[in-house]
């Protein structure tokens, strides 16, 4: 069964800066990745970035830099101030559309006990939805 992992890290240098890393553990080919915050995409969440393996990357504030790390994992740096700034309990979700598995989404947030600059290891997060 495919799995999606999500890792959230607060940068030690800038407390309003977060790095989100997501990956897809499956054998299919990824056709699209959507990163959102505030909940799953399409269920109250707001899209931060869309990554297509061949069409490129689109991102919207407070996303600063989205990129492919490997063919099956991505990273996104967020930085914000005021209303658009993420906070420690913000939920971030990654949805991977793949063929032939379909869509798989998981969410994560900053581990409650983590200090700035630290993060939980990238373990598979609970899968919220498989379309």
């Amino acid at each position: 069964t495919p799995e999606v992992w999500v890792q959230v890290r607060m940068e030690a240098t800038e407390l309003s800066s977060f790095t989100i890393r997501c990956g897809f553990l499956g054998s299919g080919s990824i056709s699209l990745v959507t990163v959102s915050w505030g909940g799953p995409n399409g269920a109250g969440g707001t899209t931060l970035a869309v990554l297509h393996p061949e069409r490129g990357i689109r991102q919207w504030a407070p996303a600063r830099q989205a990129r492919w790390e490997t063919q099956s994992s991505i990273s996104l740096i967020l930085e914000g101030s005021g209303a658009s700034s993420p906070c420690a309990n913000t939920t971030f979700c990654c949805k991977f559309a793949s063929f032939p598995e379909g869509s798989w989404e998981a969410c994560g947030s900053l581990p409650p006990s983590s200090d700035p600059g630290l993060s939980a290891p990238p373990t598979p997060a609970p899968i919220l939805r498989a379309d």
Partner: antibody
Framework: QVQLQQPGAELVKPGTSVKLSCKAS?????SYWINWVKLRPGQGLEW???????????NYNEKFKNKATLTVDTSSSTAYMQLTSLASEDSALYYC???????WGAGTTVTVSS | DIVMTQSPSSLSVSAGEKVTMSCKSS????????????LAWYQQKPGQPPKLLIY???TRESGVPDRFTGSGSGTDFTLTISSVQAEDLAVYYC?????????FGGGTKLEIK
């Protein structure tokens, strides 16, 4: 099918503003971002910016940051681009295009003339 | 900003001939993470909006005839039409799909003799 509808033409006076519309149909408006592109004869295509209707947040080409303002009205599935302080160099054909530029509107011709 | 330079600016060929046009970018359009080139080609016929032909430097959009082929990597890209048809009369644009702002080339105008 996915369609983007734009009015055919706008005639405006120098120094004024114009608000161009792009009405979307055939898909969920909030899940597909809208780009705006300028075409002047002999000058090629220029990307002005994009806006994601789900978050109302735009990105701008720095060149157009003080010229264009992108907004959306999700209730009518319409994207708008307001152009201000119009001058002759703003006379052009303006297109809206969906997502990764895979669907285009027919374009609106803006003519700035006194 | 990434500058896209196309050549030639125009060319005139007879139906059935093979055509190649070039597009060069001022920075690499290769994504190191997934080894994909973020370059697209568009066809704009007179009086019509642009139409997506090729994305990812070499992937044809669905419905695009297989006489259109995209190739290249990094900063140098080519669009080839293997056997030009009368309906291919158009301006062809390449586009940086890699990073904001999404710059286009100046276009290559294809005329049919």
């Amino acid at each position: 099918q996915v369609q983007l509808q734009q009015p055919g033409a706008e005639l405006v006076k120098p120094g004024t503003s114009v608000k161009l519309s792009c009405k979307a149909s055939g898909y969920q408006f909030t899940s597909y971002w809208i780009n705006w592109v300028k075409l002047r004869p002999g000058q090629g295509l220029e990307w002005i910016g994009d806006i994601y209707p789900g978050s109302y947040i735009p990105n701008y080409n720095e060149k157009f940051k003080n010229k264009a303002t992108l907004t959306v009205d999700t209730s009518s599935s319409t994207a708008y681009m307001q152009l201000t302080s119009l001058a002759s160099e703003d006379s052009a054909l303006y297109y809206c295009a969906g997502g990764y530029f895979d669907v285009w509107g027919a374009g609106t011709t803006v003519t700035v003339s006194s | 900003d990434i500058v896209m330079t196309q050549s030639p600016s125009s060319l005139s060929v007879s139906a059935g001939e093979k055509v190649t046009m070039s597009c060069k970018s001022s920075q690499s359009l290769l994504s190191s993470g997934n080894q994909k080139n973020y370059l697209a080609w568009y066809q704009q016929k007179p009086g019509q909006p642009p139409k997506l032909l090729i994305y990812g430097a070499s992937t044809r959009e669905s419905g695009v005839p297989d006489r259109f082929t995209g190739s290249g990597s990094g900063t140098d890209f080519t669009l080839t039409i293997s056997s030009v048809q009368a309906e291919d009369l158009a301006v062809y644009y390449c586009q940086n799909d890699h990073s904001y702002p999404y710059t286009f080339g100046g276009g290559t105008k294809l005329e049919i003799k």
